[in-house]
């Protein structure tokens, strides 16, 4: 085994990013760091095998099979896949390394299989054995982080019940407001299930896997905060576990808080209180209320007051089933072929719900944002002022919404014409929809004034291009206009647009636009 | 059903007084607070005071000094007494309890 080549054989998983999809250059995508697949000789085999590590890839994921082959002079190679024999172009790194590599774009369940690469060097020839399979997501789970309180500890921990395990990190943020976005430097991240520090604004813990992320916001009522206008409000459903926070700073300790359901107080154990001496010597107490499994019997106001701040109180409502509630009428948009438009839709949810906006069988990705008064708002602004249906589709565990968008781009029509032996046509886009006009021109009317009337067959908004109307008229040849020159002209509220035919020649017919 | 009644605004001159009063129906006041609220014309709605179960008063810092609430338990009414009123206190005033808010009542300060 002394001449056998060094090998390495490494995974290279790809990030799609939009503008390379669909491209099959060898490098098509931004990737991850490479993952080696160890590349070991197989034992009791005939000639000189070499088997990677098995590789599970995501249905949709793009991935490289590379081997880096450290032996002197050339290499030749061919790739084989289900017995069907593939182009194989390797060439040489900076440390003059071969290297071989096998594209796959958007891994599909025809791709999964045995990758089988053969190389010749001037020493010796071998195979390299790639077994790729799908991951089987069918079993996969991510479900949204709860919070349990820690066994004789201040403190509390994050579940996720997910599979493959989740990480769980917690998200914090002492700033009020828009600095507190994922982002920001205001942020701090905690990778660790159990929470000690619990005074902060802003508490989230989020879970996420090979399915993505799932977050749950501490709900927080903060006593110094001015009382707002709309009753927060928290759904759950039965079963779930119910944690409020209540939050109120003072310049000495002489104050406390108390939680009341409906105006009863808690029952010992449905709370627990901390408090903390601020930076600057102010008192900070926080007041949990929770409830391990919620039942109906749970909903209601809860009220948290303090002998130094105005109370204020929280709209629990606990329901069997998840929900998503908005108007799904449809909706008709005209603008301007500048204008500035947003498509939105507004909410109430829960669990929180996951969206896309699709136009043009083209997905595009979906923002929500909370409101004050308990909705949650997702817009769409990136149209590019291309007319046509566009779809906001909306998904929870328990509930699904569609709503669909028609926009109209307002401008003058432009026309095209075609012509046959027996009629002459012509179709415009603009919006809105044209009407159309038909005139001769000929000695008595060079300036093609006489209007044909006869033999016209008008077809409005005949066929729909991704949701975008096309007009249509058609002029049925008759003895009187053959050899002619005929005008059809379409005319909106933008203004007109005209194309001229010849009604006698054979073959392609010359047209002659002016607008 | 719960319904809230607001009453007591009108026109008063830069310095003069005005009781608002709220009277509720189909909910006990003395177990819950209350709070009042105004909205100015082009603004949004605004906190003003509140009067919690036990009689504490809060105040927002611009109308402290100026106006006191009070409750009176046996008629399930609440009172927000207004001095030295300001152009600036011009509003719709309101009363709430949790949810529940009144149709509201018209105080304009001009002279």
């Known amino acids: 085994n002394q001449d056998l080549p060094v090998i390495k054989c490494v995974l290279i998983n790809h990030k799609n990013n939009d503008s390379s999809v669909g491209k099959s250059s060898s490098y098509p995508m931004v990737s991850e760091s490479p993952e080696d697949l160890g590349c070991a000789l197989r034992p009791q085999s005939s000639g000189t095998v070499y088997e990677a590590a098995a590789v599970e890839v995501d249905v949709s994921a793009s991935i490289t099979l590379q081997v880096l082959v450290d032996a002197p002079g050339n290499i030749s190679c061919l790739w084989v896949f289900k017995h069907s024999s593939l182009n194989c172009q390797p060439h040489f790194d900076l440390q003059n390394r071969g290297v071989v590599s096998m594209v796959i774009l958007k891994m599909t369940e025809t791709q999964a299989g045995e990758y089988l690469l053969f190389i010749q060097s001037e020493a010796t020839n071998y195979t390299i054995l790639f077994t790729v399979s799908i991951r089987n997501t069918l079993l996969y789970t991510l479900r949204r982080p709860y919070f349990r309180k820690m066994e004789n500890q201040d403190a509390l921990v994050c579940i996720s019940e997910s599979v493959p395990e989740p990480i769980v990190e917690w998200v914090l943020c002492d700033s009020q407001g828009e600095s507190c976005k994922e982002e920001s430097p205001a942020v701090v991240k905690k990778e660790e299930k159990v929470l000690h520090e619990l005074f902060g604004t802003d508490i989230r813990c989020c879970a996420r896997n090979e399915l993505g992320r799932e977050c749950t916001r501490l709900f927080t009522i903060d006593l110094n905060q001015t009382p707002q206008t709309t009753l927060p409000q928290l759904f759950l459903k039965v079963g779930e576990p119910l944690w409020i926070r209540c939050k109120a700073v003072h310049v000495n300790h002489g104050f406390g808080l108390t939680w009341e359901l409906e105006n009863k107080a808690l029952e010992e154990g449905n709370y627990f209180e901390m408090s903390t001496y601020s930076t600057n010597r102010t008192m900070i107490r926080i007041l949990f209320a929770f409830v391990s499994s919620v039942a109906r019997n749970d909903t209601g106001y809860y009220t948290c007051s303090s002998s130094k701040h105005p109370s204020q109180s929280a709209l629990v409502t606990i329901v069997e089933k998840g929900f998503i509630n908005a108007t799904n009428s449809s909706e008709d948009y005209e603008i301007d072929q500048y204008e500035e438009f947003c498509f939105s839709v507004r909410f109430k949810a829960y669990p929180q719900i996951r969206c896309t906006w699709t136009f043009s069988r083209k997905s595009f990705p979906c923002e929500q944002k909370g409101l004050d008064n308990g909705y949650s708002i997702s817009k769409f602004c990136n149209h590019k002022h291309q007319p046509g249906e566009y779809i906001f589709h909306a998904e929870n565990d328990d509930a699904q919404f569609t709503k669909m968008f028609t926009l109209n781009i307002r401008r003058k029509p432009q026309v095209l014409a075609e012509a046959s032996a027996s009629q002459a046509s012509c179709f415009s886009d603009g919006y809105p929809l044209p009407s159309w006009t038909w005139k001769k021109c000929s000695d008595k009317s060079p300036n093609c004034t006489e209007e044909i009337t006869e033999g016209v067959w008008n077809r409005k908004a005949n066929r729909k291009v991704f949701g975008q109307w096309v007009s249509s008229s058609t002029l049925n040849m008759s003895e009187a206009i053959k050899g002619f020159l005929v005008k059809c002209c379409a005319y909106n509220s933008l203004g007109t647009s005209c194309e001229t035919i010849l009604l006698n020649s054979p073959g392609p017919f010359p047209f002659i636009q002016d607008n | 059903q719960v319904q809230l009644q607001e009453s007591g605004g009108g026109l008063v001159q830069p310095g003069g007084s005005l009781r608002l009063s709220c009277a509720a129906s189909?909910?006990?006041?003395?177990?819950?607070?209350i709070d009042w609220y105004r909205q100015a014309p082009g603004k949004q709605r605004e906190w003003v005071a509140q009067?919690?179960?036990?009689?504490?008063?809060f105040y927002a810092d611009s109308v402290k000094g100026r106006f006191a609430i009070s409750r009176e338990n046996a008629k399930n009414t609440v009172y927000l007494q207004m001095n030295s009123l300001k152009p600036e206190d011009t509003a719709v005033y309101y009363c709430r309890v949790l949810s529940y808010w009144g149709q509201g009542t018209q105080v304009t300060v001009s002279s």
């Open positions: 009067i919690t179960r036990d009689s504490n008063s």
């Open positions: 189909g909910v006990t006041f003395s177990i819950n607070y």
